[in-house]
Amino acid sequence: TQNKALPENVKYGIVLDAGSSHTSLYIYKWPAEKENDTGVVHQVEECRVKGPGISKFVQKVNEIGIYLTDCMERAREVIPRSQHQETPVYLGATAGMRLLRMESEELADRVLDVVERSLSNYPFDFQGARIITGQEEGAYGWITINYLLGKFSQKTRWFSIVPYETNNQETFGALDLGGASTQVTFVPQNQTIESPDNALQFRLYGKDYNVYTHSFLCYGKDQALWQKLAKDIQVASNEILRDPCFHPGYKKVVNVSDLYKTPCTKRFEMTLPFQQFEIQGIGNYQQCHQSILELFNTSYCPYSQCAFNGIFLPPLQGDFGAFSAFYFVMKFLNLTSEKVSQEKVTEMMKKFCAQPWEEIKTSYAGVKEKYLSEYCFSGTYILSLLLQGYHFTADSWEHIHFIGKIQGSDAGWTLGYMLNLTNMIPAEQPLSTPLSHSTYV
């Protein structure tokens, strides 16, 4: 007689990443009996919600339910019905909602209440929606990549199971770029973290970690572009802005009201003699780079050393995983290879930005023009941020690994967030039961 397969004893969890530009739903799965083991949780699905970020629904909250439907229904299909009631659902909102809250706490609360109402009506164990702090976003991103890279495992291996693994227990730093903020998180080498706000202490799997983290609000790629436009239009002689960060021949009309809508441009706000202006691309990497550098105030530092805007940054240490928009942008530009030096990246960016807009549109016919038009800026911004903002050099560039997925799971804060909220990262090293790592029973 045939042996009947035992039912899979697995658990699921759902995390929604409500970012500034869009929302993504992630479904995670793990063996129920191995909850405390490192590296057992993996992503089984990612569903990108169609539409903008939740902060854009502030004037149309009644549309939030429909907006979330497709991905929540997908979760219903992927997760077995018998597991629905036990599957936790978490929603974390990031910098887009931080900015909305700065403008109006009442409006931010209304959006979150309606998001919660929509998510509560699914048969999962919904645990609530909240705006996570920049510090949490950095910390959870760091936990995610190191968990997936096996850095918390005490078992030394003679073989490498994941890319980038140098087979030591040195953790990777985490570089996260979103639309509205960017995070840098790493363990400095024997360096005191001079500002308490940037210091985190963790005990994970029996080991202590002193971690540095900072989230730069308004320095995500979308908000950085708004900042740059607001800064540059101040000195424009008329309603034409000749912009080196866009391809030659590119034209776009921008409403001044849209430019000043975000708190990120408040410092550049002024009364302009026009309601609209036209961006005209001139495609010059060097000038674009120079314009971006003006967003970073490096003249003031109350610590031994700073990133920019007076924010403490210890000397960089070890390898770094650069993910989210760092990865998406560099992947589009074909610059994620470990073999591409920083000098080569700069050369490629110079060539790319100089390409005429019509040529670019033809070469990338399948890409939405809104996104396509911004890769020159985004690529240049990434280089400026990493080199001048965080002080990477041509030599240390090789320590940056542009990562999309590790072991099939997206690099980002969501997995770390779920691991923390489901208590799946123990402070102490779990005791191995005799059978827990055996090949067969």
Epitope: H84, D109, R110, L112, D113, V114, E116, R117, L119, S120, N121, Y122, P123, D125, F126, Q127, G128
Partner: antibody, heavy 119, light 107 residues
Framework: QVQLKESGPSLVQPSQSLSITCTVS????????VHWVRQSPGKGLEWLGV???????DYNAAFMSRLSITKDNSKSQVFFKMNSLQADDTAIYYC?????????????WGQGTTLTVSS | DIVMTQSHKFMSTSVGDRVSVTCKAS??????VAWYQQKPGQSPKALIY???YRYSGVPDRFTGSGSGTDFTLTISNVQSEDLAEYFC?????????FGTGTKLEIK
Amino acid sequence: QVQLKESGPSLVQPSQSLSITCTVSGFSLTNYGVHWVRQSPGKGLEWLGVILRRGSTDYNAAFMSRLSITKDNSKSQVFFKMNSLQADDTAIYYCAKTAVVAGDYFDYWGQGTTLTVSS
Amino acid sequence: DIVMTQSHKFMSTSVGDRVSVTCKASQNVGTNVAWYQQKPGQSPKALIYSASYRYSGVPDRFTGSGSGTDFTLTISNVQSEDLAEYFCQQYNSYPLTFGTGTKLEIK
């Protein structure tokens, strides 16, 4: 254990207003929403409105112009106020807890407060 | 507004029998339907949500089914304590609406 208890007048004159307080225990108003539902022999169960955990409200459009729901988290109380009452507002008024954080279905109901609108 | 119709005002059954209470929505509500039990002189008690998910503590003789516009609450092996009125409720869109109720009588 979870409990909700409505307290309010049993008789109100036509055109007057109604105020009911729902006092909750066993859960926090910062974690769950509270709905209001009424029941009458003529109209059955009617949903009136909800206050969600951060304080935003939604009302049944049929009652919106004369209804207000507020709360005091520290006192674990939700306040229901309806203006311009008429005879057909005679009903049992219930407060009910959202089953999940902010869901639109209810796992616990108060015992109800019976209201008669009459001169 | 979505109208929830419970066509049977009363249903008569015997202890040990199986009975099905039906509810029809005037438009598609997916599976956003809950069922409540109300005993005479008491407030409603939650039984089922999302059309077919039972609350913990609710006896497994209560089963919900259906999606779209047609929903059923089935009570198998009816007990005398099941004498009550049963209401369906849709929460697919505002305003939330309830069925007119079905009174279960024990023969």
